[in-house]
Interface confidence: low
């Protein structure tokens, strides 16, 4: 029959070449001379020339050694034609299977594999996987079947069989208990990959297993007892640095300390923070300590870690005795800011108020007073009694020194301690208005036409406060009423000035007297420019020139 069974050819054949593989034979050769040929990849297409056929005998020839890792199977077609070139058979499938030789070693995909596992884990915990490849056939032969093994372990502590490797997957697992990062932080395993499922060629690689830290060591105070001295009243003052040791991995959550004041700080006077580099506990004052109230505090501080302990561990406690040192404290004005109402313009020498301070110290210290800041120079203060008196004219309307009716003064108290200390107080004088200002019109210059003039509206201002302001009254004096009229509007805050008789173009003085609700009168001269024009004007036109 015109059929060829699959032909198996081992790779890396030694020859000699060409090597006869099989004979193609058509039974039509009884009737006519047959010529044989082959086509397909490996024959007439790339890689050409690997196989050939003896044209007349039909022998299939192999021209060179085969490489299964390059091409594992060739699919060719056999052809039979008569002398005249006519096809006498259908093309026949020729399958050539390249059988494997163990001509490749396993090769690890990395020189060094890295993995990690927590210290103290149970046997059976998976750590990492190593991988080796072998280009040989692992399906039909064992040539490419890789078996993994551990050749050696460094260090061999606590013993030399801490890990195992799965023969076929390369998964490395913990086989023994006793992984302790604080004793052995890293293991180096020499792993082997052997083909023929462990019976063939071997290659090695390194597997580095990093032992990760678990919080299996508690921080411990060293020392456990401290004495410290702190001046009273100091806020944010560093009282003491507490030192701990922890065997866990530095700068990890299992090593970083967390401090807690367990007792002795009923008044919430202290706080403790962790120094980011040294891991020390920094005890500081949250608020000032008072020697007069309590001159000694005994604190109990406990230390743990940022990370929870992985097993039950005793916590370490430190005792800190804090001695409060007496300090000469500054006198304190009572109240620190004092508001006093006083009428503006009171006579010089008139008392304003008494403003005194108290000394927190237990000794009876003498306190003396003086004015520290008096912007307008209006006040004086008795050094012994704290009596404040007027030495200048208090003016509510003085915009340079008075804001919102308030004049602010700073006073100082000094004790006779060693060294002396000072305290300050603020005196806020609310100045009560008196009717010491008359009303004033704005603007004080006007321009008006002498024909059909527009009425001029002037605003009235008075620096005083109600009731010493509107309603205002207006009156023209010094014969100004011959040519002008002045009327206050209904609201009483503006005055309307009108020209009632013709005046030639010129500048005139209009004498306007305004008085407020308290009859405080103010005379103001208004400069009126009269123009030769009709109705509204802003500036006088120049003389008209004909032509």
């Amino acid at each position: 029959d015109w059929v060829v069974a699959p032909i198996s050819v081992p790779e890396n054949g030694k020859g000699p070449f060409p090597q006869r593989l099989n004979q193609l034979k058509s039974n039509k050769d009884r009737d006519t001379k047959i010529f044989y040929s082959i086509t397909g990849p490996g024959a007439d297409s790339p890689p050409e020339g690997v196989f050939a056929v003896e044209k007349e005998t039909g022998w299939l020839l192999l021209n060179k050694p085969l490489d299964r890792e390059e091409i594992a199977k060739y699919e060719l077609f056999g052809h039979a034609v008569s002398e005249n070139g006519a096809s006498v058979e259908d093309p026949m499938n020729i399958s050539i299977i390249v059988t494997d030789q163990n001509d490749h070693k396993p090769k690890f995909t990395q020189d060094t594999f890295r993995g990690s596992v927590l210290e103290g884990v149970m046997p059976g915990t998976s750590v990492m996987q190593v991988t080796a490849t072998d280009e040989d056939d692992a399906v039909n032969t064992y040539n490419g079947v890789v078996a993994y093994s551990i050749h050696s372990q460094e260090p061999k502590e606590p013993h030399d069989l801490m890990f195992t490797i799965h023969k076929s997957t390369g998964t490395i697992s913990v086989i023994s208990s006793g992984l302790d990062r604080e004793k052995v932080p890293e293991y180096r395993l020499t792993v082997q990959a052997t083909d023929m499922d462990g019976e063939g060629s071997t290659t090695t690689a390194e597997a580095v297993v990093q032992i990760l830290d678990a919080n299996d060591n508690a921080p411990e105070f060293d020392p456990q007892k401290y004495e410290a001295h702190v001046p009273e009243n100091a806020v944010g003052h560093e009282v003491q640095r507490l030192t701990v040791t922890d065997l866990d991995a530095p700068n990890s959550p299992a090593w970083r300390a967390t401090y807690l004041i367990m007792g002795g700080d009923d008044g919430d006077h202290f706080t403790i923070t962790t120094h980011p580099e040294s891991n020390q506990g920094i005890l500081t004052t949250r608020k000032g300590l008072d020697f007069e109230a309590k001159n000694q505090h005994t604190l109990y501080v406990e230390v743990t870690n940022e990370a929870p302990f992985v097993l039950k561990l005793p916590t370490s406690t430190a005792t800190i005795v804090v001695h409060v040192e007496d300090v000469n404290e500054a006198p304190v004005f009572v109240p620190p800011s004092k508001v006093v109402e006083v009428q503006e313009g009171i006579p010089t020498g008139e008392p304003v108020c008494v403003y005194t301070a108290e000394d927190p110290d237990k000794e009876n210290q003498k306190i003396s007073y003086r004015i520290l800041r008096d912007p307008a120079g209006w006040l004086a203060m008795d050094p012994d009694s704290g009596q404040v008196t007027a030495v200048g004219t208090l003016d509510r309307e003085d915009e340079q020194f008075v804001r919102n009716n308030i004049y602010e003064v700073m006073v100082l108290a000094m004790d006779n301690g060693s060294p002396p200390t000072t305290g300050t107080g603020t005196l806020l004088l609310t100045l009560i208005d008196v009717n010491d200002h008359g009303p004033v019109p704005e603007p004080r210059q006007i321009t008006i036409c002498n024909q059909s003039p527009v009425r001029q509206v002037l605003n009235i201002t008075d620096k005083d406060l109600s009731p010493h302001t509107s309603p205002f009254q207006a009156q023209l004096t010094d014969d100004s009423d011959i040519y002008w009229t002045a009327e206050v509007n209904e609201e009483g805050d503006t005055v309307v000035l009108s020209l009632k008789k013709f005046l030639k173009q010129d500048t005139y003085d209009v004498h306007l007297s305004l008085s407020d609700h308290g009859n405080k009168e103010q005379l103001t001269v208004i400069r009126a420019t009269v123009c030769d024009c009709h109705g509204h004007v802003e500036t006088c036109p120049g003389p008209w020139k004909g032509g």
């Epitope: 020339g49 890792e69 070693k105 090769k107 990395q110 020189d111």
Partner: antibody, heavy 121, light 107 residues
Framework: VQLVEQSGAELVKPGASVKISCKAS????????MNWVKQRPGKGLEWIGR????????KYNGKFKGKATLTADKSSSTAYMQLSTLTSEDSAVYFC??????????????WGQGTSVTVSS | ELQMTQSPASLSASVGETVTITCRLS??????LAWYRQKEGESPQLLVY???TLAEGVPSRFSGSGSGTQFSLKINSLQPEDFGNYYC?????????FGAGTKLEIK
């Protein structure tokens, strides 16, 4: 970025030996063949041999057997070529070049910048 | 030993032209031929391998063809950076021989 960095130029006396290096980075050094190629001034390229750093396997051009010795240090990802009993014929630029993949049937895709060796008394 | 004949030995062309370099071998290496370009004072650069596969980053104006014993490298629309020495290389069997080279110069 895959890089192949070679050692600097060498001036050596006839009869002496020289060892030149080729440091690789950016790829799996131990699982790629490293080739060495010679180029005399104004001439073409000659393949010297290759080494598989993973297990030290070597293959030489017969012409350079006894002249060149190829080694590799996996820990530093460095390949070395030692040239012995130097003559003026050995004055050339020597390139190292990474082979593209496993197996023989691949080309050289990353080349070092070359090391010039001058043999002169 | 496998013999490789690269032609022409030198070639002068202008920017924008198309050129072809050939490489003939004394025995069948199937499709396992590579092409490299080397500029003055530089390392060789892989252009094509397995007869027609372009290496990473190589412009499409380069194309390789051939199999068995006859191979060629074609460069369409020459650019200024294309000038230099071109080498073919057998990467099928040991030793990995190179052709003698073709010097491509600017006209």
């Amino acid at each position: 970025v895959q890089l192949v960095e070679q050692s600097g130029a060498e001036l050596v006396k006839p009869g002496a030996s020289v060892k030149i290096s080729c440091k690789a980075s950016g790829y799996a050094f131990s699982s790629s063949w490293m080739n060495w190629v010679k180029q005399r001034p104004g001439k073409g390229l000659e393949w010297i041999g290759r080494i598989y750093p993973g297990d030290g396997e070597t293959k030489y051009n017969g012409k350079f057997k006894g002249k060149a010795t190829l080694t590799a240090d996996k820990s530093s990802s460095t390949a070395y070529m030692q040239l012995s009993t130097l003559t003026s014929e050995d004055s050339a630029v020597y390139f190292c070049a990474r082979q593209r993949d496993y197996g023989a049937l691949y080309a050289m895709d990353y080349w070092g910048q070359g090391t010039s060796v001058t043999v002169s008394s | 030993e496998l013999q490789m004949t690269q032609s022409p030995a030198s070639l002068s062309a202008s920017v924008g032209e198309t050129v072809t370099i050939t490489c003939r071998l004394s025995e069948n290496i199937y499709s396992y031929l590579a092409w490299y370009r080397q500029k003055e004072g530089e390392s060789p650069q892989l252009l094509v391998y397995n007869s027609k596969t372009l290496a990473e980053g190589v412009p499409s104006r380069f194309s390789g063809s051939g199999s068995g014993t006859q191979f060629s490298l074609k460069i369409n629309s020459l650019q200024p950076e294309d000038f230099g020495n071109y080498y073919c290389q057998n990467h099928y069997g040991f030793p990995f021989t190179f052709g003698a080279g073709t010097k491509l110069e600017i006209k």
